[in-house]
């Protein structure tokens, strides 16, 4: 058995809806996609030994799904998927890669072949522990590259300041594969928020740790960089859930005077 | 307000090629696509291709496929119609108009081609 | 590319009268269907789109309806300003098409 959770149940049936769905919030110019046609071009990794799908496997899924992403609305992200989603609202706030359509239909599953048999294997699917070549790590890094290199304008990026082992992963999707693809010629900047967990350890903030070699790197590479701990209106996001806690005090005078009324 | 403000009338010969602009403003120019359309004197409207605002796509009517190349300068706002290997057929006014429902046209630039 | 069928060519009718205009997809097009009318020498208007969908500042006497492959346009009360030509058009992925359109001339 593989390290990983099985193929996803019912994974064409939530890929081709999820796609259909998807549709409508594209441009007129682009709403046309053949979700059908995609989902065979994603289908060839299903019929290829699970520890050898390279990512350039995936390159006609990418050509036929690909679309437009809006200047100033890439999120970028590593240890808040949740948020991220939650913060996007399906492309209204931003579009992490996640909300374009060849990240959607294919958000929290998972897939791949058995070892030596022609059907999906439902049990278990290989991660990068097992091996590096698999389904699953192939098709997220195919996909970060397309949407980094689709990426325009101010680019945002979601960290987690309470992430054990550092806010910024020097080993990660986003450090290995989308950093590298940003095109310098369409960024006017890079903006990061650095969010802690409600009442969660404040691991780490700008300027700390991990953070300082994703400012210098990003500097090196000529970016503009700007960094904010606890973005506000994500924060604000975060504390529904936790509205009695004290990191989720209003503490503006006009609260104040409201709370008293 | 949206805009898109077209170059003059043009008379070219038959072979030639022809570049015209439409100049836009009042919008987030990256976030459209641009469509051109001609209409030939007394006919329909026909649709010849469009571009998105960030350069990334672009597509084309298999009739102009090969003959009309759209490009942007993001500087300025403005997309530019080439048209090559103009015959007299291709006389026409030829509009552009924002993405993705056409609601705003430019005024067109009208193209005569002859001798 | 989608072909869509537009029809009568041309009619004639009277102030106060009601007209409909009709145009035909070759496959499904869902709801995406928009309609423009245009007078002579003057660009096209939105008049509608998304099948019933008003543009801006379009009086309420048009009406679009519709879906999949068969879609029409209605002008209740014909005003002296609706003369002139009307086309239908999908926004339902490039290649964009237009019908052949429709001209409507005072009777």
């Known amino acids: 058995r593989w390290r990983g959770e099985g193929t996803s149940a019912h994974l064409r049936d939530i890929f081709l809806g999820r796609c259909a769905e998807y549709r409508a919030l594209l441009s007129p110019e682009q709403r046309n996609k053949n979700c059908t046609a995609i989902w065979e071009a994603f289908k060839v990794a299903l019929d290829k030994d699970p520890c050898s799908v390279l990512p350039s496997d995936y390159d006609l899924f990418i050509n036929l799904s690909r679309h437009s992403i809006p200047r100033d609305k890439s999120l970028f992200w590593e240890n808040s998927h949740l948020l991220v989603n939650s913060f996007a609202d399906n492309t209204r706030r931003f579009m992490p890669l996640s909300d374009v359509l060849y990240g959607r239909v294919a958000d929290f599953l998972s897939w791949c072949r058995q070892k030596n048999d022609s059907g999906l294997d439902y049990q278990s699917c290989p991660t990068s522990e097992d091996c590096e070549n698999n389904p699953v790590d192939s098709f997220w890094k195919r996909a970060s590259i397309q949407y980094s290199k689709d990426s325009s304008g101010v680019i945002h990026v979601m960290l987690n300041g309470s992430e054990p082992t550092g806010a910024y992963p020097i080993k990660g999707f986003f450090a290995d594969y989308e950093i590298p693809n940003l095109q310098k010629e369409k960024i006017t900047r890079i903006e990061i928020w650095v969010m802690h967990e409600i009442g969660g350890p404040n691991v780490e903030s700008c300027g700390e740790g991990s953070m300082k070699v994703l400012e210098k790197r990003l500097k090196d590479m000529g970016f503009q960089y700007s960094c904010i701990n606890d973005y506000r209106p994500v924060k604000l996001l975060q504390c529904v859930d936790h509205s009695t806690h004290p990191d989720c005090a209003l503490k503006s005078a006009a609260a104040a005077t409201q709370r008293k009324a | 307000q949206v805009q898109l403000q077209q170059s003059r009338a043009e008379l070219v010969m038959p072979g030639a090629s022809v570049k015209m602009s439409c100049k836009t403003s009042?919008?987030?120019?990256?976030?459209?696509?641009v469509h051109w359309v001609r209409q030939r004197p007394g006919q329909g409207l026909e649709w010849i291709g469009a571009?998105?605002?960030?350069?990334?796509?672009?597509d084309y009517s298999q009739k102009f496929k090969g003959r009309a190349t759209l490009t942007v300068d993001e500087s300025s706002s403005t997309v530019y119609m080439q048209l090559s290997s103009l015959t007299s057929e291709d006389s026409a006014v030829y509009y552009c108009?924002?993405?993705?429902?056409?609601?705003?046209w430019g005024q067109g630039t009208t193209l005569t081609v002859s001798s | 590319d989608i072909q869509l069928t537009q029809s009568p060519a041309s009619l004639s009718a009277s102030v106060g009268e009601t007209v409909t205009i009709t145009c035909r997809a070759s496959?499904?097009?869902?709801?995406?269907l928009a309609w423009y009318q245009q007078k002579q020498g003057k660009s096209p208007q939105l008049l509608v789109y998304?099948?019933?969908t008003l543009g801006e500042g379009v009086p309420s006497r048009f009406s679009g309806s519709g879906s999949g492959t068969q879609f029409s346009l209605k002008i209740n009360s014909l005003q002296p300003e609706d003369f002139g030509s009307y086309y239908c058009?999908?926004?339902?992925?490039?290649?964009?098409?237009f019908g052949s359109g429709t001209k409507l001339e005072i009777k």
């Open positions: 571009i998105d605002g960030s350069d990334t796509f672009n």
């Open positions: 058009q999908h926004h339902y992925g490039t290649p964009f098409t």
């Open positions: 998304n099948t019933k």
């Open positions: 496959e499904n097009i869902y709801s995406y």
């Open positions: 009042g919008y987030t120019f990256s976030d459209y696509w």
């Open positions: 108009a924002r993405g993705g429902l056409l609601q705003y």
